[in-house]
C-alpha cells in the first residue's frame, strides 16, 4: 500500500516550519509547497455569509487559534 | 469553475479490472487534490484516495492495494485502475477535486460500477 | 480510522421546521485552529453538493440557513427553516486524518 507523506497527524503534528517566499503551507500534507501548486476556487461573492477566504497557510502566519484566516490576497491564496 | 466527467463504468464479472477515467476542464490536475469517492446502491459515500499536485497517492487502506489512481497531464484526466474486482465494489464512482481543508467542492457526474456474474 | 457517527439516521419534518443534525467523531478532527469537518447534501441520483467547509464555512452559493458548528469531535449542521428542495441526505466528513471518513448519512424526510 503506497501511503502519502503524512505521518504525524492530529494532535500530533508539529507546528510547520515557516515557509519561504512563494510557498505556501498545504495544510493536507502538512509540508510547504510552491504556492501555484495549489487549486484555486472560486471567489466568494460579495456579501457571503461566511466571509473567512478559503486560504493555505501563508509564509506570515503563525499557527494556532484562526490559522488559515488569512484576509490579504497572498500569494498562497487558494 | 472545474467540470469533471466520469466514464468507463459497466459490467465486469468478480476478479475482473476496469479503468475509469475523469477528464478535468476549467483547471489543472497538476494543482490541488484529486479524488474518487464512491458509493455503494442504497449506502452512503466512501473515500477512495487521491493524486495531488506532486502525483503522490493515498488510498483508503480498506482497499487492500486493489486500486491504483494515476494521471494524464497532458489530458488533464485522472484514472482509478481497479482489480480483483468483488460484488462489494459495486457503486457509482464519482472524482472529485478539494479545498485547501479537504472539503470536495467538485464532483462528477458519476459513473456506475456492477461487478456480477 | 476516525469513525464519524451522525444521528438521527433519519428524520421526518415539515417546510419551516428548524432542523439539527449532529456528528461526533472518535477523535478530534481539529489541527492548527482549524476543523477538518465538512458537510454535503445528495439527492437521489445526484452528487453530494458541499454545504458547509471547515465546521462553519458556507460554500458558495449556498442559502444562508444553512449554518455548522462545533469543534474537537461534536459538530452540528442546523438547517433554521426548512424548505422544500432540503430534503435530502445529509452527510458529515473528516480530513483530519487519513484515510478520510463520511458519517453514514442522515436522511431529512416530509413529515
Known amino acids: 500500500m503506497r501511503r502519502g507523506p503524512r505521518s504525524l497527524r492530529g494532535r500530533d503534528a508539529p507546528a510547520p516550519t515557516p515557509c519561504v517566499p512563494a510557498e505556501c503551507f498545504d495544510l493536507l500534507v502538512r509540508h510547504c509547497v510552491a504556492c501555484g501548486l495549489l487549486r484555486t476556487p472560486r471567489p466568494k461573492p460579495a456579501g457571503a455569509s461566511s466571509p473567512a477566504p478559503r486560504t493555505a497557510l501563508q509564509p506570515q502566519e503563525s499557527v494556532g487559534a484562526g490559522a488559515g484566516e488569512a484576509a490579504l490576497p497572498l500569494p498562497g491564496l487558494l | 469553475e472545474v467540470q469533471l466527467v466520469e466514464s468507463g463504468g459497466g459490467l465486469v464479472q468478480p476478479g475482473g479490472s476496469l479503468r475509469l477515467s475523469c477528464a478535468a476542464s476549467?483547471?489543472?490536475?497538476?494543482?490541488?487534490?484529486w479524488n474518487w469517492v464512491r458509493q455503494a446502491p442504497g449506502k452512503g459515500l466512501e473515500w477512495v484516495g487521491y493524486?495531488?499536485?506532486?502525483?503522490?497517492?493515498y488510498y483508503n487502506p480498506s482497499l487492500k492495494s486493489r486500486f491504483t489512481i494515476s494521471r494524464d497531464t497532458s489530458k488533464n484526466t485522472l484514472y482509478l485502475q481497479m482489480n480483483s474486482l468483488r460484488a462489494e465494489d459495486t457503486a457509482v464512482y464519482y472524482c472529485?477535486?478539494?479545498?485547501?481543508?479537504?472539503?470536495?467542492?467538485?464532483w462528477g457526474q458519476g459513473t456506475l460500477v456492477t461487478v456480477s456474474s | 480510522d476516525i469513525q464519524m457517527t451522525q444521528s438521527p439516521s433519519s428524520l421526518s419534518a415539515s417546510v419551516g421546521d428548524r432542523v439539527t443534525i449532529t456528528c461526533r467523531a472518535s477523535?478530534?478532527?481539529?489541527?492548527?485552529?482549524?476543523?477538518?469537518m465538512h458537510w454535503y447534501q445528495q439527492k437521489p441520483g445526484k452528487a453530494p453538493k458541499l454545504l458547509i467547509y471547515?465546521?462553519?464555512d458556507l460554500e458558495s452559493g449556498v442559502p444562508s440557513r444553512f449554518s455548522g458548528s462545533g469543534s474537537g469531535t461534536d459538530f452540528t449542521l442546523t438547517i433554521s427553516s426548512l424548505q422544500p428542495e432540503d430534503f435530502a441526505t445529509y452527510y458529515c466528513?473528516?480530513?483530519?486524518?487519513?484515510?478520510?471518513?463520511f458519517g453514514q448519512g442522515t436522511k431529512v424526510e416530509i413529515k
Open positions: 472529485a477535486t478539494t479545498l485547501p481543508y479537504g472539503a470536495m467542492d467538485y
Open positions: 476549467g483547471d489543472s490536475i497538476t494543482r490541488g487534490y
Open positions: 493524486i495531488n499536485y506532486s502525483g503522490t497517492t
Open positions: 477523535e478530534s478532527v481539529d489541527d492548527y485552529g482549524i476543523s477538518f
Open positions: 471547515r465546521a462553519s
Open positions: 466528513q473528516q480530513t483530519s486524518k487519513d484515510p478520510w471518513t
